[in-house]
């Protein structure tokens, strides 16, 4: 299964309106929204409509789109109105190869890394923004601290944990704290005057299809925090995995296609075939996420121009015992990071 659908050009001929030059109004003010937001199919983002009014299921590749029914911004889709001249009222969601991203009204080019603020580093890959926190103490001090508080320190970007019961702190807890920190997914090792740190990979930015996952690491010559990114594909969007769940079972933890295929990315094809495993689905309220995985390097060959390689998430096994929060909110897992709102807003 391809990492990314091969970009296609689709044409759409809208039904003629009485007045072909009149643009219909798709937004109504004041906003009129249903009481509860819609439930979107797996992998389809739940987003605010183009009128900035209601939650809608984002239009997908090939779907009709309007100023209200907007295309999925997390999938690098844009509304192509070229088939609706001269009104430009109804378009078709299309994929731009190497599409850039827009965050807070600022456009970023494909592959560009940027800091929306001092707390986060983000990367744009094919319309998807993946961010990692630069403040490396997302957890309160453990073991000895009974009353931790997260406070802003004047002149410093990152908030610090302070402990109101500092006076009762037992001695020699630094070693314990370090162990607790190391067990939490951070990789620590001391070399020269640098404490090496590698954050865990962020969750994949999409629940199906091609997404991005990022992490920060200072394991480099300068001991400087740098962002690494890898492509991820938790499950294909075009396969109904529920159909593969065995009789009597509630989950299919891992879905693996029968045939090995090439990965494709922006029109380029992997130099060898792969038979990847994908995370499956459950019929109850559980979600399947990668449990045992590694990062592999995939070489791509392009029809014109040089090839390139990309780091790609390779799933070995998935864990299906987490309750699903909102499977359509691709940034839901970022909420566990402090100041998530600062990325989202």
């Amino acid at each position: 299964t391809a990492l990314s659908p091969t970009p296609t050009t689709m044409t759409f001929t809208p039904a003629p309106l009485e007045e072909t030059t009149t643009r219909p109004e798709f937004c109504k003010w004041p906003c009129e929204c249903p009481q509860s937001p819609p439930r979107c199919p797996l992998g389809v983002s739940l987003i605010t409509d183009g009128c900035e009014c209601c939650k809608i299921c984002a239009q997908q590749l090939g779907d009709n789109c309007t100023e209200a029914a907007i295309c999925d911004p997390h999938r690098g889709l844009y509304c192509d109105y070229s088939g609706d001249r001269p009104r430009y009222a109804i378009g078709v969601c299309a994929q731009v190869v190497g599409v850039g991203c827009v965050l807070d009204g600022v456009r970023y080019t494909n592959g560009e890394s940027f800091q929306p603020n001092c707390r986060y580093n983000c990367t744009c890959i094919d319309g998807t923004v993946g961010c990692t926190p630069l403040c490396l103490s997302p957890r309160p001090p453990r073991l000895w601290c009974r009353q931790p508080r997260h406070v802003r320190v004047p002149g410093q970007c990152c908030e610090q944990w302070v402990c109101d019961d500092d006076a009762r702190r037992p001695r020699q807890t630094a070693l314990l704290d370090t162990r607790a920190f190391a067990a939490s997914g951070a990789v620590e090792q001391r070399y020269e005057n640098c404490i090496a740190y590698t954050s865990p990979w962020s969750p994949c930015s999409t629940t199906c299809g091609l997404g991005i996952s990022t992490r920060i690491s200072n394991v480099n010559a300068r001991c400087w925090p740098e962002q690494e990114s890898r492509l991820c594909n938790l499950r294909p969007c075009d396969v109904d995995i529920q159909l593969h769940i065995k009789a009597g079972k509630k989950c299919l933890a891992v879905y693996q296609p029968e045939e090995a295929t090439n990965f494709t990315l922006a029109g380029c094809v992997s130099t060898r075939t792969y038979r990847p495993k994908y995370c499956g689905v459950c019929t109850d309220n559980r979600c399947c996420i990668p449990y045992k995985s590694k990062t592999i390097s995939v070489d791509f060959q392009c029809p014109e121009g040089p090839g390139f390689s990309r780091q790609v998430l390779w799933i070995n096994a998935c864990f299906c015992n987490l309750s699903c929060r909102n499977p359509n909110d691709i940034f839901a897992d970022l909420e566990s990071y402090p100041d998530f709102e600062e990325i989202a807003n």
């Epitope: 933890a253 045992k292 590694k294």
Partner: antibody
Framework: EVQLVQSGAEVKKPGASVKVSCKVS????????MHWVRQAPGKGLEWMGG????????IYAQKFQGRVTMTEDTSTDTAYMELSSLRSEDTAVYYC??????????????WGQGTLVTVSS | QSALTQPPSASGTPGQRVTIACSGS????????VNWYQQLPGTAPKLLIY???QRPSGVPDRFSGSKSGTSASLAITGLQAEDEADYYC???????????FGSGTKLTVL
């Protein structure tokens, strides 16, 4: 090639807990599903539990539910099996054995050398 | 009481063909694959047959497995002295939601 090396023999009193370790080399734990099997003296093999790739969670034999905990430390590629509230009938050789995710079928191969746990007052 | 039943013992002379049966039910062998393990005296078990009839590399072709309905069997042709060991079948049991081993068969080469 995967190799599993287990911790040494243990003697425990009834009611105590034992924690057996299993160190992986040749592969990393992220590529393996670890299972634990025990064998009482002169008796057959008894599966205790392990990560089931099909169900996507660690499953335990009903007999050991609530008494056994299986954990992993991926930074050291070491798996652990802790059995609590020990009784004399828990005296056995405890084996770790792996299922490799590369395989299309569930098969336990290879196995650790075994750890003898003796429960005696 | 094992979910899979095996005869406690089997025997044969060198060069002979021996089969070991493994009987289960629709909740295990009937709907899942069977593996066979060999345990030589004083050693850890070793995978002998997986997926009913597949041999891992390094296992001689004298060993073969088969499955029919809710039963499986292991056949050893051209029996050799070094085949003297305990043999266990293993499958997944849906009703128990776990993996199960047979009671084991002690093979003696006379």
């Amino acid at each position: 090639e995967v190799q599993l090396v287990q911790s040494g023999a243990e003697v425990k009193k009834p009611g105590a807990s034992v924690k057996v370790s299993c160190k992986v080399s040749g592969y990393t734990l992220t590529e393996l599903s670890m299972h634990w099997v025990r064998q009482a003296p002169g008796k057959g093999l008894e599966w205790m539990g392990g990560f089931d790739p099909e169900d996507g969670e660690t499953i335990y034999a009903q007999k050991f539910q609530g008494r056994v905990t299986m954990t992993e430390d991926t930074s050291t590629d070491t798996a652990y099996m802790e059995l609590s509230s020990l009784r004399s009938e828990d005296t056995a050789v405890y084996y770790c054995a792996t299922f490799m995710f590369d395989h299309d079928w569930f098969q336990l191969d290879p196995w650790g050398q075994g750890t003898l746990v003796t429960v005696s007052s | 009481q094992s979910a899979l039943t095996q005869p406690p013992s089997a025997s044969g002379t060198p060069g002979q063909r021996v089969t070991i049966a493994c009987s289960g039910s629709s909740s295990n062998i009937g709907t899942n694959t069977v593996n066979w393990y060999q345990q030589l005296p004083g050693t850890a078990p070793k995978l002998l047959i997986y997926n009913n009839n597949q041999r891992p590399s390094g296992v001689p072709d004298r060993f073969s497995g088969s499955k029919s309905g809710t039963s499986a069997s292991l056949a050893i042709t051209g029996l050799q002295a070094e085949d003297e060991a305990d043999y266990y079948c293993q499958s997944y049991d849906r009703s128990l939601s776990g993996y199960v081993f047979g009671s084991g068969t002690k093979l003696t080469v006379l």
